[in-house]
């Protein structure tokens, strides 16, 4: 090899590098070195390129024409096909032709951002150039066509098309099977349909922050499989519905911050099983409802910092047990950490939990239960005045708590504080001073002597009539009342909550007196009330009184409202034969749902229930009686139960049975002169008619024959010998007839006959 | 770091009166309690009272009452006892002390105070 | 006035030894209960605070307690704990203080 060429006079070298950037050149340089691997030209006034100096540059890959005044993509000349990058950032060009890139055989990465280009046609990227990154970042695009960058299915893995002018995009709009990046930010995209980037199979980032996406259609991520982080920031959904995430298997983020979602619904997040962190900060979440992200069971990382929420239900966050991060930052959920227990149950591995700024004046004994697991938790930003005995005490791992509130009412009830926070090494982060009493004001928490703890008084008020839980009969008006005292002249405000949420138009009066004991005391009562109650009212009512000093919440007292049981079907008399099934319709409403029971004449122990053929339906509100039987008849009484009353109905069950004999009718010999008498006991329903016959006809009645009644019984006396034959008795009613004999023997008188034996 | 200075050993006649100062430094002055503790030759150590700087407020304790006043200058970031009418009894170390939790954390060097006829 | 009583007045222990002082309180002092080491012509010295928080002291020093009755524990005595050990209750004023535990090595 010869001695090395030397630099290009107007250029700067280093290694294989040739900088020639911000020399203000309007042409190439004419003495470019052959051994350039790497060429500056970036930051001049070249606004076009002669190829022909691009000659002799066997060895160049990567070329910077950045920041220059080209209006089209140059040609290098020869060295086209070696060229691995091309940067062409901030020039002026308007558009790309297929054409100019074809000589680019080894291309891979070129930028065309920040330039004037207006649309992408099919036409600009032909097969050929194996680009693997594409920036169009930063131009006037608004049109992309149908397969645009279908030249590049084999090789492209990033697109970059953020900030451009992008309205829509097509169903399929990129058949790019082998694309991990797509960037798509800062555009003007209103809608995303379905099916809109199939064709992605490789995507891993989506980006589509600060756009106008007012609606995901369902399926609209269908197809991208392999995607783990999907930016939506920035945009106006107002909803995350389930079948928008379909197909989102391997989704591991998802950035929904600073959209106007109102509602995070239940189902949908099924879709992202892999879901590891959920960002919905800055919405307009008002409330958290139960097991609301319960298919979520990977989410690690939860921010919901800069909602609005006031509402979290107990359960809300039932099913996260791998979350570790919950930021509820700069929310309204005082109320969730004053009084409730259990809104965060289910968070077994939670180790961070941040609620600065959330306006809570105090904390609940049970607020944080469910967190025993807690290292990390941040109330800084809260104006806390109390804390109650050992809120904090079952974090057994809590490494770090940030307090910063110069409210603190320093009473009896906060001289656990300081000696729990120093013998648990977590006064770093705390900074706490008394507000009340006035000679304390200022003082750190730390330093007040632990007998100025002292309870004088009672500045924050002190429930003494709770709600009671009530029943009441639909369209009725009932009241629920709640008073308390405090030793304060503060002002004081009055608050329903129902279902934990507060009630914003509320019938409430409110009454204040000085106490009967002690003249100091003040005694606030309010009365809640409720008009015409319906279902609608059912729930737990609780007030909240406030003053300056803190909240006070009452017990929760339960409303049920009751409608008394009436029939929507009752059962009707029923005629049926034996051995077939019974079937009684019986249906009620009422609120609460009344209990249906069955009883026969007045007892549950009756023949169906006891032997088992007793079956009651109850969607269909039928009762049956199967193989049905003669006991089985009688009234039966459905009754319809609630909290409210019981009412009854009842109807009668008759049997009908072929008529039978009970007992055998049995041949007989008698002696003349005898009496002898025939049964015909026969059972049947209706009960049967008895019909004698001798042979084939009638019976004709002589003095000597008498019946029963109800001819079950035929009694011959002084038999005679004419009355021998067959008698036949024959049982009649409306199911059939039945027919027994009994063949009568008639002997002459007693007496010896010639073989010695005694005759009758 | 926190230090506390107190002022050098005094000898007085019994009747008379003594004033020995505390200076605070590596904290907030205002911000903290002080306390005076004494501890008189094979005696049990013996609280006289503390004061709040920030706002002034002291505590005496019933038995030195109307013959101990504690001060503070927090310009100077100091704190004053003096201990009039005295007796021999009140032969003693005295310590200014800061408080943290009911426990002295930090302690000045002491002042002896000798009643002597 | 709370009454703190120290047992024992002294003790001499051997090196290595486990020390324990107890100290009572007249009444229920909330673990507001303070230890001391004072050497001759020496400052006391805050071992424990609030019954079991260690201040800046060796571990082998560790306090228990709670109501009336509380102790000082010296897991391994060394030397250099030749002091004099006083007990301080810090719930109520008058702040009073036990008549001390004189320890030695034997």
């Known amino acids: 090899a010869g001695p090395r060429a030397p630099c290009a006079a107007a250029c700067t070298c280093a290694g294989d590098s040739l900088d020639c950037g911000g020399r203000g050149l309007a042409a190439l340089p004419g003495d470019l070195p052959s051994w350039t691997r790497s060429l500056n030209l970036s930051y001049n006034k070249l606004s076009e390129i002669d190829p022909a100096g691009f000659e002799d540059l066997p060895n160049l890959q990567e070329v910077y024409l950045n920041n220059n005044e080209l209006t089209a993509v140059p040609s290098l000349g020869a060295a086209s096909s070696h060229v691995v990058s091309l940067f062409l950032q901030h020039n002026k060009i308007r558009s790309v032709e297929g054409s100019q890139l074809k000589a680019y055989l080894s291309l891979e990465v070129l930028d065309l951002s920040l330039n004037n280009i207006t649309e992408v046609r099919n036409t600009c990227f032909p097969h050929g150039p194996p680009i693997k990154e594409l920036n169009l970042a930063g131009n006037r695009i608004g049109t992309l066509e149908l397969g645009a960058f279908d030249g590049l299915s084999r090789s492209l893995l990033t697109l970059r098309l953020s900030k451009n002018r992008i309205t829509q995009l097509p169903v399929r709009a990129f058949k790019l099977p082998r694309l991990t990046q797509l960037d798509l930010n800062r555009n003007r995209i209103r809608l995303i349909e379905g099916l809109t980037f199939q064709g992605l199979n490789s995507l891993e980032v989506l980006k589509l922050q600060r756009n106008n996406i007012s609606k995901l259609t369902d399926g609209a991520f269908w197809g991208l499989s392999k995607m783990h982080v999907l930016h939506l920031e920035y945009n106006s959904l107002v909803e995350v519905n389930s079948g928008s995430l379909y197909g989102l298997t391997a989704l591991h983020q998802l950035h929904l911050s600073n959209n106007s979602i109102a509602r995070i619904h239940r189902k949908g997040w099924s879709f992202c099983q892999k879901l590891h962190e959920l960002v919905l900060s800055f919405n307009n979440l008002t409330r958290l409802d139960e097991e609301s992200l319960a298919e979520l069971s990977s989410l690690s990382v939860l921010r919901l910092s800069h909602n609005s929420i006031s509402h979290i239900a107990e359960g809300a966050f039932k099913g996260l047990r791998s979350l570790r991060v919950l930021d509820l930052d700069h929310n309204e959920i005082s109320g969730t950490i004053e009084d409730t227990s259990g809104a965060f149950s289910g968070l077994d591995s939670l180790s961070k939990l941040t609620l600065f700024g959330n306006k809570i004046k105090s904390v609940a004994k049970r607020a944080f239960s469910g967190l025993e697991g807690l290292e990390h938790l941040n109330l800084g930003g809260n104006a806390i005045r109390s804390v109650q005995f050992d809120a904090f005490v079952k974090m057994k791992n809590l490494k770090e708590l940030h307090i910063s509130s110069d409210s603190f009412l320093c009473d009896c009830q906060l001289k656990w504080l300081p000696p729990w926070l120093i013998g648990r090494m977590l006064q770093a982060f705390v900074t706490a001073t008394c507000a009340h009493p006035e000679s304390l004001k200022g003082q750190s928490i730390f330093s007040v002597p632990p007998e100025s703890f002292v309870c004088d008084d009672f500045l924050k008020p002190q429930i003494i009539t709770q709600p009671e839980t009530t029943m009441a009969m639909v369209g009725k008006d009932i009241r629920f009342t709640c008073s308390a005292a405090s030793s304060s002249s503060s002002p004081m405000t009055f608050a329903w909550k129902k279902d934990n949420e507060v009630l914003t138009n509320a019938d409430m009066e409110n009454f204040v007196h000085v106490h009967a004991q002690d003249g100091e005391v003040m005694e606030y009562t309010t009365i809640l009330h409720l008009r015409q109650v319906t279902f609608g009212h059912e729930g737990r009512y609780q007030c909240v009184i406030t003053n300056h000093f803190g909240s006070t919440y009452s017990h929760k007292a339960r409303l049920t409202v009751n409608v008394l049981p009436s029939f929507t079907k009752t059962p009707h008399d029923i005629t049926i034969r034996t051995t077939t099934m019974a079937r009684l319709e019986c249906a009620a409403t009422g609120h609460p749902n009344p209990q249906i029971a069955w009883q026969k004449d007045g007892g549950t122990d009756f023949p169906a229930a006891r032997e088992r053929r007793m079956h009651v339906m109850p969607d269909d509100d039928v009762f049956f009686i199967t193989d049905v039987k003669i006991d089985d008849a009688g009234v039966y009484s459905c009754t319809a139960q609630n909290s409210a009353g019981s009412i009854s109905a009842n109807a009668t069950l008759t049997v009908l049975e072929t008529p039978s004999l009970v007992v055998p009718l049995e041949d007989r010999v008698v002696s003349v002169g005898e009496t002898v008498a025939l049964q015909c006991k026969a059972t049947g329903n209706p009960p049967p008619r008895i019909t004698w016959f001798k042979g084939d006809r009638p019976l004709s009645l002589t003095e000597r024959h008498h019946l029963t009644p109800d001819n079950q019984l035929l009694v011959v006396q002084n038999v005679v010998a004419e009355d021998a034959g067959r008698y036949t008795c024959e049982m009649s009613n409306t199911l059939g007839t039945e027919r027994a004999h009994s063949q009568l023997s008639v002997l002459p008188a007693a007496g010896c006959r010639k073989d010695g034996t005694t005759v009758g | 770091q926190v230090q506390l200075v107190q002022s050098g050993a005094e000898v007085k006649k019994p009747g008379a009166s003594v004033k020995v100062s505390c200076k605070a430094s590596?904290?907030?002055?205002?911000?903290?309690?002080l306390h005076w503790v004494r501890q008189a030759p094979g005696q049990r150590l013996e609280w006289i009272g503390w004061i709040y700087p920030g706002n002034v407020n002291t505590k005496y304790n019933e038995k030195f009452q109307g013959r101990v006043t504690l001060t503070a200058d927090k310009s100077a970031s100091t704190a004053y006892m003096e201990l009039s009418s005295l007796r021999s009894e009140d032969t003693a170390v005295y310590f200014c002390?800061?408080?943290?939790?009911?426990?002295?954390?930090?302690w000045g060097q002491g002042t002896l105070v000798t009643v002597s006829s | 006035d709370i009454q703190m009583t120290q047992s024992p007045s002294s003790l001499s222990a051997s090196v290595g030894n486990r020390v324990t002082i107890t100290c009572r309180a007249s009444q229920d002092i909330s673990n507001y209960l303070s230890w001391y080491q004072q050497k001759p012509g020496k400052v006391p010295k805050l071992l424990i605070y609030y019954t079991s928080i260690h201040s800046g002291v060796p571990s082998r020093f560790s306090g228990s307690g709670s109501g009336t009755d509380y102790s000082l524990t010296i897991s391994s005595l060394q030397p250099e704990d030749v002091a004099t050990y006083f007990c301080q209750q810090g719930n109520t004023l008058p702040r009073t203080f036990g008549q001390g535990t004189k320890v030695e090595i034997k």
């Open positions: 590596g904290y907030t002055f205002t911000s903290y309690y």
């Open positions: 002390a800061r408080e943290e939790l009911g426990g002295f954390a930090y």
